[in-house]
Amino acid sequence: VTGSRVYPANEVTLLDSRSVQGELGWIASPLEGGWEEVSIMDEKNTPIRTYQVCNVMEPSQNNWLRTDWITREGAQRVYIEIKFTLRDCNSLPGVMGTCKETFNLYYYESDNDKERFIRENQFVKIDTIAADESFTQVDIGDRIMKLNTEIRDVGPLSKKGFYLAFQDVGACIALVSVRVFYKKCPLTVRNLAQFPDTITGADTSSLVEVRGSCVNNSEE
């Protein structure tokens, strides 16, 4: 959850909610009674910005949360890493029937980086996210969290950027970290030929042809 947040060299981060200074200020619909930005303390006494919703008593929940616009920087496939807590409905009294244990992840490609509203029908569903059996127990300052981590990928992307959205249908969720990244093959030298940083293709198995150049003091 915390720390210097060093990621693998072949991953380029497009969004990291944990690195944002100040409030995240994402767009929620409805404006009140749904997703709420809540700060909690990490073990270094600095705030972690989370988004939370927990309307487990009320039926027919449809709460949306949308990120700011995310540039794709030429990536055709991006990865979304979500760290979250999701409370077991069995541990909550009197919520059977209304309490859920999943949420939905969506995306919407756009060239417009200033869309002000959430239009649900524009979004394409990536997946339904559930709490995995495996979780990391994290002791953050004055509280303990059971943190689930799920990674999904989406592509091929073609527009300048995209928005992510999270739909709650009646669960008790805290989104603790959202990171969006793409993968690249780092600069490589083979047989005196140098090949530049290269963004991976639209599929994980795609081959991307790149032109190399001779290293210094060598020639073709």
């Epitope: 006494n45 004055d142 509280r143």
Partner: antibody
Framework: QVQLVQSGSELKKPGASVKVSCKAS????????MHWVRQAPGQGLEWMGW????????TYADDFKGRFVFSLDTSVSTAYLQISSLKAEDTAVYYC?????????????????WGQGTTVTVSS | DIQMTQSPSSLSASVGDRVTITCRAS??????LAWYQQKPGKAPKLLVY???NLADGVPSRFSGSGSGTDYTLTISSLQPEDFATYYC?????????FGQGTKVEIK
């Protein structure tokens, strides 16, 4: 229903020890940590610390390190507060209160259920 | 440690009055704050959590507001059963200290 029932009032002499119990019912004991709060006569509430009901690990506020011990007997869903070497200034009502052991968001992050309080009087 | 300063320490009011109690934290507690009501000889009862959210079963005349270091509990129209002592408590790093309390008395 969910409740925390504490042991009865105690009258002790200075230097003695006392053990206050807090019996939980109506919920899974290990789903909630147990906290202790002191209220001296005519005074406000003081948070003393808490005990992890899964591991038994206690955490004490600075003013309550040394003579105060939190413990558990999970087989009977009971938390205990023991005070040794009692002093006149330990005279107070002691409350137990629960909060979820794991943080799932602010919706349940507060003391929702309290014991009725145990009065401990220290007097010679 | 974070200090919680409540004001006033006591107040006299009549039934139907609007009552405001404030709580100031010594540093930003990011709305990690609860309000409790306590009557003589009884355990505290939760009124408001996360600074602004009314607890289940609490009458709508109670409301919480604030952010950063400054928080307020408001009773819009004081009722006879509201005469009690009110405490704020922060949840931003242990120790989770309480304010010193505000006693609401009948004028």
């Amino acid at each position: 229903q969910v409740q925390l029932v504490q042991s009865g009032s105690e009258l002790k002499k200075p230097g003695a020890s006392v053990k206050v119990s807090c019996k939980a019912s109506g919920y899974t004991f290990t789903d909630y940590s147990m906290h202790w709060v002191r209220q001296a006569p005519g005074q406000g509430l003081e948070w003393m610390g808490w005990i992890n009901t899964e591991t038994g690990e206690p955490t004490y506020a600075d003013d309550f390190k040394g003579r105060f011990v939190f413990s558990l007997d999970t087989s009977v869903s009971t938390a205990y507060l023991q005070i040794s070497s009692l002093k006149a200034e330990d005279t107070a009502v002691y409350y137990c209160a629960r909060i979820p052991l794991y943080y799932y968001g602010s919706r349940y992050w507060y003391f929702d259920v309290w014991g009725q309080g145990t009065t401990v009087t220290v007097s010679s | 440690d974070i200090q919680m300063t409540q004001s006033p320490s006591s107040l006299s009011a009549s039934v139907g009055d609007r009552v405001t109690i404030t709580c100031r934290a010594s540093e930003n507690i990011y709305r990690n704050l609860a309000w409790y009501q306590q009557k003589p000889g009884k355990a505290p009862k939760l009124l408001v959590y996360a600074a602004t959210n009314l607890a289940d079963g609490v009458p709508s005349r109670f409301s919480g507001s604030g952010s950063g270091t400054d928080y307020t509990l408001t009773i819009s129209s004081l009722q006879p059963e509201d005469f009690a002592t009110y405490y704020c408590q922060h949840f931003w790093g242990t120790p989770w200290t309480f304010g010193q309390g505000t006693k609401v008395e009948i004028k």
